[in-house]
């Protein structure tokens, strides 16, 4: 009742491993690292075969095929690429994967190596078997900034990708007879997020309460060069409207806001986010240049004659930008004071503009980004949002833009978002 | 509700002034343009002249200009028209009416809200 | 300036009949920007007048679907398909293309 002598599969082996076997005996056949038993196209661990009375095998020897990881997982915002050649996916091959540069980087870092383990699985040494994350790179034009820049007001039209955060958000009250429609500005964190002023998104009531616009209302561009022309823009309608708390519509103090996109948007040359800066309440330093842009009004000298005799708007149809220091705070309070009214520049807003005026922001630029481009991390980022000015003509003397101080929201910024700081800490400012 | 409500009616003698408001609620009353309008008895409409209450630019029907003057007050939301040397032709109902926004991409001049209008009676 | 005449003075119509409005203008409304600005408003006795038609065949909000609008360059039509007593009195057309901005006379619809 002897049985015939077994032969080890290739890359296999029996156990145990016997001269001679018998009625009865039990042999156990197993693969080497990175192989499968496979029997009847069956993949498993081990297969065990017995020698049967009639001095038969109960089964034959299954072969060891090679662990197979098959195609890896899709990286959203990211590439793969192969390391071996003909693209194996078996055992021991290795893949990478990258992210979109320059619109997206690797979390942490990470090498985006992963090899194809034995248990079939692609493995990372930092992530284990997740897959790494592609986050949007924040504050890099797509074009590099001109040193020399003029107004919005009188002013220099923006070339596409030079303000690739710039948003324009369209709200249409159609609830209202006649309908309501207003337009501002926004900046893009994220690939669902934008940041602009709570003025912008609050609901125009009789009264003083501060209620948001329905979200239903609200329609955010992006990409955007020429009002007139949005075929080339990306446009998304918004999930949440979320305006601060605190937001106070007598003195525009905490004029901030958020708006989440229904669906994030895809980055590329002319649309990428503007970065954060950190946590600090002295904002941007006196005189420091800053960069904002907008579709608001470019000439407010222009009169009314001109405008119903020539059928032309006073809002700018190409987005324009304007250079404008940082004003030191006492110099902008002492300016509001001076003047009739009741204007209170608080310690979460800044300013900035010209004594002699000729350069602002004005109406249909508000919510825009103020950004300053830091030197040490080489982003642009975002000190302030267009919030308001006055009470005179945009551009006047002596009349300074104010700004929403972003740095002191950072934290309510990163808690509206969900995002732990600690995930997007290398692109914000240093 | 969008709302424009005007002042009571005005009687006055003939080489007198006049003065009437126009005060608006339910919308963001810098952000439009006001219009009004001179409506004589059982006749058709004229237009007077425009304001852009946002920074009090005006411009006239070349018939009205040294006839009225068009102010605007922010902090109150209410738009002023006086009439100066009154004479029995300017006896009428006068309204004013919201223009387009400053927000419309195209400045389509109708006027979507119209006031309650305004009576000026000239009489010695 | 632009003379906007409308036509008829008088519109004597039964309840549930088409009305036909016509406007014409001395010169032709279409704009350098290529829109043209005609526009029609309903003054109801004892009223202010309101908007009903803009750039010549856009319904304002609130407007029932029995009113339209049509025409060009100089010639315009308002109809309403099926009158209702509601819409009783005077339909004025307006052009705001020309400055200083013009009404035509108007047109009393009435009930026979």
């Known amino acids: 009742n002897e049985c015939p002598e077994l032969q080890p599969p290739v890359h296999g082996k029996i156990e145990p491993s016997q001269a001679k076997y018998f009625f009865k005996d039990q042999v156990l056949v197993s693969c080497d690292t990175g192989y499968k038993v496979l029997k009847d196209n069956v993949e498993m661990d081990t297969f065990q075969i017995e020698c049967l009375k009639d001095g038969t095998w109960s089964n034959k020897i299954p072969t060891c095929k090679i662990v197979d990881c098959r195609a890896p997982g899709e990286l959203e915002h990211g590439l793969i690429t192969f390391s071996t050649r003909n693209n194996l996916t078996t055992y021991k091959s290795e893949i990478k994967y990258s992210c979109q540069e320059p619109y997206y980087k690797m979390l942490n870092n990470n090498t985006g190596i992963y090899t194809c383990s034995a248990q079939g699985v692609w493995m990372n040494k930092v992530l284990g078997r997740s897959l790494p994350t592609c986050l949007p790179e924040c504050g890099q034009p797509s074009r590099s900034l001109p040193s020399l820049v003029k107004r919005i007001i009188g002013g220099r039209n923006a070339e596409p990708g030079l303000f690739p955060w710039q948003a324009l958000i369209v709200v249409e009250d159609t609830s209202r007879v006649p309908n309501d429609k207003w337009f501002g500005s926004g900046a893009l964190l994220s690939a669902s997020w934008i940041l602009t002023a709570a003025h912008v998104l609050r609901s125009q009531r009789r009264d003083t309460t501060v209620i948001p616009v329905s979200k239903e209302h609200v329609t955010v561009y992006l990409g955007l060069h020429d009002v007139r022309d949005k075929s080339g823009a990306v446009n998304s309608s918004a999930a949440r409207v979320v305006l601060h708390p605190d937001f106070n519509i007598q003195n525009y103090n905490h004029d901030i806001a958020l708006v989440q996109l229904q669906e994030p948007v895809p980055l590329g040359p002319h649309v990428m986010p503007v970065c954060l800066p950190r946590l600090e309440p002295e904002g941007p330093a006196p005189h420091m240049l800053g960069l904002v842009a907008g579709w608001g009004i470019s000439n407010p000298n222009v009169t009314v004659d001109e405008i119903i005799s020539s059928g032309t708007r006073t809002l700018s149809d190409v987005l324009q930008y304007v250079k404008l220091p940082v004003v030191p705070h006492a110099e902008c309070k002492t300016s509001y004071e001076s003047r009739s009214g009741n204007y209170s520049v608080t310690e979460n807003m800044f300013c900035a503009g010209y004594y002699e005026g000729g350069k602002d922001t004005c109406l249909g630029d508000s919510g825009g980004a103020f950004v300053i481009f830091d030197d040490l991390s080489q982003r642009w980022v975002v000190q302030g949002l267009v919030s308001w000015g006055g009470p005179e003509e945009c551009g006047s003397k002596q009349v300074y833009g104010v700004y929403t101080k972003v740095s002191n929201y950072v934290d309510w910024v990163w808690e509206q978002m969900g995002l732990p700081q600690s995930v997007v800490e290398p692109q914000v400012e240093r | 509700e969008v709302q424009l409500q005007q002042s009571g009616p005005v009687l006055v003698k003939p080489g007198a002034s006049g003065k009437m408001s126009c005060k608006a609620s339910g919308y963001k009353f810098t952000d439009y343009y006001m219009i009004w309008v001179k409506q004589s008895h059982g006749k058709s409409l004229e237009w007077i002249g425009v304001?852009?209450?946002?920074?009090?630019?005006?411009s006239y029907n070349q018939k009205f200009k040294g006839k009225a003057t068009l102010t605007v007050d922010k902090s109150s939301s209410t738009a002023y028209m006086e009439l100066n040397s009154l004479t029995s032709e300017d006896s009428a109902v006068y309204y004013c009416?919201?223009?387009?926004?400053?927000?419309?991409?195209?400045?389509?001049?109708?006027?979507?809200?119209w006031g309650t209008g305004t009576t000026v009676t000239v009489s010695s | 300036d632009v003379l906007m005449t409308q036509t008829p003075l008088s519109l004597p119509v039964s309840l549930g009949d088409q009305a036909s409005f016509s406007c014409r203008s001395s010169q032709s409304l279409i704009h350098s920007n290529g829109n043209t600005y005609l526009h029609w408003y309903l003054q109801k006795p004892g009223q202010s007048p309101k908007l009903l038609i803009y750039?010549?065949?856009n319904r304002f909000s609130g407007v029932p679907d029995r009113f339209s609008g049509s025409g060009s360059g100089t010639d315009f039509t308002l109809k309403i398909s099926r009158v209702e007593a509601e819409d009783l009195g005077v339909y004025f057309c307006s052009q705001s293309t020309h400055v200083p901005w013009t009404f035509g006379g108007g047109t009393k619809l009435e009930i026979k």
């Open positions: 750039k010549v065949s």
């Open positions: 304001i852009k209450i946002y920074n009090g630019g005006t």
């Open positions: 009416a919201r223009g387009p926004s400053l927000y419309d991409y195209d400045p389509y001049w109708y006027f979507d809200v």
